[in-house]
């Protein structure tokens, strides 16, 4: 049994880190492999993650962690029974992928404006809470070429767009993702999309 692609891990900088790797051939990850992880600290326990399959040769493990701080470092050992396949380490603060924003809602009852709101995925005491910026993707359900990205670089998780910038009588979808500039993170996954109907009509004189 051989590791083809070594484990790479990302942290949500809160409580979960996700590690993925590829094996040299088809593998029943949960039956054959165990990923052991331990915070490098004198009295820390070694926890065991039972991986799950991620494609034919891919495996994925979710590591449950304490509230992450910048100096945290974990040792990782990938075992197949009593055989050590790979040994490595992981510093969560250096490989951050934020959680996806949630509760994306579209408010169309404000005249001439489409208001999008969503929730910051972190509690206020988390370091990432005040460091997130967002990208909002809006697209026309009937014309995928009619798609745009709005960058939200302020802290408030809201976006206002004039309804007139969208085609009238068309259904649109939106989704949002986040990243944290000061932590040099990757983008989060996109939030689930939400759909609305743009019923805005231009005033008669402008038609």
């Amino acid at each position: 049994m051989k590791v083809l692609q070594e484990p790479t891990c990302v942290s949500d900088y809160m409580s979960i880190s996700t590690c993925e790797w590829k094996m040299g051939g088809p593998t029943n990850c949960s039956a054959e492999l165990r990923l052991l992880y331990q915070l490098v600290f004198q009295s820390s326990e070694t926890h065991t993650c039972v991986p799950e399959n991620n494609g034919g040769v891919g495996c994925v493990c979710h590591l449950l962690m304490d509230d992450v701080v910048s100096m945290d470092n974990y040792t990782l050992d990938l075992w197949a029974g009593q055989q050590l396949l790979w040994k490595g380490s992981f510093k969560p603060s250096e490989h951050v992928k934020p959680r996806a924003p949630g509760n994306l809602t579209v408010h169309t009852n404000v005249s001439d404006t489409v208001l999008l709101t969503w929730s910051n995925p972190y509690p206020p005491d988390n370091y990432l809470y005040n460091d997130l910026t967002y990208a909002v993707n809006i697209w026309n359900e009937n014309d995928l070429a009619d798609s745009r990205i709005h960058n939200v670089t302020y802290l408030k998780p809201t976006l206002r767009i004039p309804a007139s910038t969208l085609k009238s009588g068309i259904s649109y979808r939106a989704r949002v993702r986040a990243w944290a500039q000061h932590y040099n993170t990757t983008w989060s996954e996109w939030s689930p999309s939400t759909k609305w109907y743009n019923s805005y009509r231009e005033p008669f004189e402008q038609r």
Epitope: S15, I16, S30, L36, S43, E45, T46, H47, T48, C49, V50, E52, H62, L63, L64, M65, D66, D67, G81, Q82
Partner: antibody, heavy 129, light 109 residues
Framework: ESQLVESGGGLVQPGGSLRLSCAAS?????????MCWVRQAPGKGLEWIAC?????????YYASWAKGRFTISKDNSKNTVYLQMNSLRAEDTAVYFC????????????????????WGQGTLVTVSS | IQMTQSPSSLSASVGDRVTITCQAS??????LAWYQQKPGKPPKLLIY???TLAYGVPSRFSGSGSGTDFTLTISSLQPEDFATYYC???????????FGTGTKVTVLG
């Protein structure tokens, strides 16, 4: 330094109740590990009672014999874990240890306690009339 | 799950090689730990995951086995090693943790 201190033991009559406390210091009781109770009757071996996951999920596991009479709970704000013991019998007389445990997880919702790494000094419970 | 530990007691001399065994009633992979306990004290973790030495434990202690059969070995018994030893098996099918009945190691003679 990480430490566990048990309290609440003492003499109780058969059929009575008692609540034991375990105060954690040097680490957060709400972090990623299990907190457990283990007991040892005088001159006898060790017997696992129950565990509670210290994170937000708070999932619990009990020894089959402990279900119903014993309840494990936690108060993260006080860094404390409790063991509520009801309908006590003479055979419940023992030193009760609090212990921190590692875990095995599959995904983020299936987590179960593994070995006990850090132990308190124990508190003696005597059930007698 | 049941854990059968043997022997229940043994007498040995300083410098002796001591072996204690533990058998699980079902396959527990490598989810086995060994503890040392002295009178009036809480147990002390020696080995976890069947063969991994806990922090600060002398290298004369070693563990082996997987599945159902496990062994704790003390390669050269020291005066401070006279104590009672327990195995602990963990079953993830039930989430239960079961201790062996213990092995008391006493001074020969």
């Amino acid at each position: 330094e990480s430490q566990l201190v048990e309290s609440g033991g003492g003499l109780v009559q058969p059929g009575g109740s008692l609540r034991l406390s375990c105060a954690a210091s040097g680490f957060s009781s709400s972090s990623a590990h299990y907190m457990c109770w283990v007991r040892q009757a005088p001159g006898k071996g060790l017997e696992w009672i129950a565990c509670i996951y210290a994170g937000s999920r708070g999932s619990t596991y009990y020894a089959s014999w402990a279900k119903g009479r014993f309840t494990i709970s936690k108060d993260n704000s006080k860094n404390t874990v409790y063991l509520q013991m009801n309908s006590l019998r003479a055979e419940d007389t023992a030193v009760y240890f609090c212990a921190r445990a590692a875990f095995v997880n599959r995904g983020v919702s299936w987590i179960w306690p593994y070995y006990f790494s850090l132990w308190g000094q124990g508190t003696l419970v005597t059930v007698s009339s | 799950i049941q854990m059968t530990q043997s022997p229940s007691s043994l007498s040995a001399s300083v410098g002796d090689r001591v072996t204690i065994t533990c058998q699980a009633s079902e396959d527990i992979e490598s989810y086995l730990a060994w503890y040392q306990q002295k009178p009036g004290k809480p147990p002390k973790l020696l080995i976890y995951r069947a063969s991994t030495l806990a922090y600060g434990v002398p290298s004369r202690f070693s563990g082996s086995g997987s599945g159902t059969d496990f062994t704790l070995t003390i390669s050269s018994l020291q005066p401070e090693d006279f104590a009672t030893y327990y195995c602990l098996g963990s079953s993830y099918s039930t989430g239960s943790n079961i201790f062996g009945t213990g092995t008391k190691v006493t001074v020969l003679g």
